[in-house]
């Protein structure tokens, strides 16, 4: 969480941003809030990116003002207009690109004053893993698959019964480049699994951490997946 203040003494307003991550090819949100102001026509929202000459987005007098927008963001940005009234200046970024990563500034002007805060935006690919029993294998085997990751993650297996055990000797992980030549499909196989145990396949890079759990008993198979973005710090 980053909290910024205006620089002009009593004419300063608090602006708050939250560091976040974008999943390439999907839509992302750059979070920014400010002290709401009753005079809506005075509210100006500017999004800037370090190293980019033009604006990422500008909203003023109740509408988008995109004449100064940088080419790389053309047609890809929007604020939530009806949320500006409650102090939400968050930016929706469509079709996130790897090159969208960087430091952004959310700059706000209201009738009460000015303020800004920076936001670190990471980009990559992350997806939920699915763990299944591989019935084609010769021994009891689990297969963990996640369709899109970037940068290349690490994969670690764990089990509820053998806590702390190292499964690197009895597992095999491969990374297969997807058709767009950036993201990769992650496939990890765990051999010699025992029944009545819960196994977890944990995939992690510097952007996200995802876990796929599977519990295999005589009568049923239970699955659960969880994905968590890392470094979501507010500013």
């Amino acid at each position: 969480l980053i909290i910024g203040f205006g620089i002009s003494g009593r004419h300063s307003i608090t602006v708050t941003t939250v560091a976040s991550a974008g999943n390439i090819g999907e839509d992302g949100i750059l979070s920014c809030t400010f002290e709401p102001d009753i005079k809506l026509s005075d509210i100006v929202i500017q999004w800037l990116k370090e190293g980019v000459i033009g604006l990422v987005h500008e909203f003023k007098e109740g509408k988008d003002e995109l004449s100064e927008q940088d080419e790389m963001f053309r047609g890809r940005t929007a604020v939530f207009a009806d949320q500006v009234i409650v102090g939400n200046a968050s930016l929706r970024l469509k079709n996130v690109q790897l090159t969208d990563a960087g430091t952004y500034k959310c700059y706000i002007i209201t009738s009460k004053g000015k303020g800004n805060a920076n936001l670190e935006y990471k980009t990559g690919a992350f997806s939920m893993p699915e763990v299944n029993v591989d019935y084609n294998a010769s021994s009891e085997t689990l297969r963990c698959e996640a369709p899109r990751w970037f940068p290349q993650p690490t994969v670690v297996w764990a089990s509820q019964v053998d806590q702390g055990a190292n499964f690197s000797e009895v597992s095999n992980t491969s990374f297969e480049l997807n058709s767009e030549n950036v993201t990769m499909k992650v496939v990890s196989v765990l051999y010699n699994v025992t029944i009545n145990n819960t196994y977890s396949c944990m995939i992690e890079n510097d952007i996200a951490k995802a876990t796929g759990d599977i519990k295999v008993t005589e009568s049923e198979i239970k699955r659960r997946s969880h994905l968590q973005l890392l470094n979501s710090k507010a500013s």
């Epitope: 709401p36 102001d37 009753i38 005079k39 026509s41 109740g62 207009a81 500006v84 009234i85 409650v86």
Partner: antibody, heavy 116, light 107 residues
Framework: QVQLVQSGAEVKKPGSSMKVSCKAS????????ISWVRQAPGQGLEWMAG????????HNAQKFQGRVTITADKSTSTAYMELSSLRSEDTAVYYC?????????WGQGTLVTVSS | EIVMTQSPATLSVSPGERAALSCRAS??????LAWYQQKPGQAPRLLIY???TRATGIPDRFNGSGSGTEFTLTISSLQSEDFGAYYC?????????FGPGTKLEIK
């Protein structure tokens, strides 16, 4: 000096509609949102709906969804609130107010009585 | 939808004394909270917004505090004109919900 002047008291039959007007003066009408807040006899304040002329958007409280329509005429600096399918529980004083997010100027209120 | 609650429902205080009115939100509203005063037969009047900023013309005996979900309006030395109903209101999210109110009466 900002002023919000509302239309006069009305008596309505159950099932009918009401339309209250609110004329603003003293500041740029479209620079602010206009909200409608009602107060039933002896009860508290209830936010009904808001319109943001500069954004061209309106929001209603869930409770009034489908029954309330708010509009704004920028040329005359007047906001309107229409409530349909009236019932006795809609008997209240209806206020127009400047805002949100908070409400700094209020109209004098319009008493609407719904009675058969 | 955010639910606002106020306590007490009625508060009896003598003129010159201090009054503390409480407002609670069902989830965090950050600093997006306002207080209003209403006297019988009159429209409400904005007292405070942004938790603690007094609206134009509001005397400094009115003070707001709190953050997140717990808020207090304190009137340091009650004057006869301060008696009436007080409402808190959140503006973190649509819809803009008011609390049920606290009636401040003369003891």
């Amino acid at each position: 000096q900002v002023q919000l002047v509302q239309s006069g008291a009305e008596v309505k039959k159950p099932g009918s509609s009401m339309k209250v007007s609110c004329k603003a003066s003293g500041d740029t009408f479209s620079s602010y949102a206009i909200s409608w807040v009602r107060q039933a006899p002896g009860q508290g304040l209830e936010w009904m709906a808001g319109i943001i002329p500069v954004f061209g958007t309106a929001h209603n409280a869930q409770k009034f969804q489908g029954r309330v329509t708010i509009t704004a005429d920028k040329s005359t600096s007047t906001a309107y609130m229409e409530l349909s399918s009236l019932r006795s529980e809609d008997t209240a004083v209806y206020y127009c107010t400047r805002g949100g997010p908070y409400f700094d100027y209020w109209g004098q209120g319009t008493l609407v009585t719904v009675s058969s | 939808e955010i639910v606002m609650t106020q306590s007490p429902a009625t508060l009896s205080v003598s003129p010159g004394e201090r009054a503390a009115l409480s407002c609670r939100a069902s989830q965090s509203v950050s600093s997006n909270l306002a207080w209003y005063q209403q006297k019988p037969g009159q429209a409400p009047r904005l007292l405070i917004y942004g938790v603690s900023t007094r609206a134009t013309g509001i005397p400094d005996r009115f003070n707001g505090s709190g953050s997140g979900t717990e808020f207090t309006l304190t009137i340091s030395s009650l004057q006869s004109e301060d008696f009436g109903a007080y409402y808190c209101q959140q503006y973190k999210k649509w819809p803009f919900i008011f609390g049920p109110g606290t009636k401040l009466e003369i003891k």
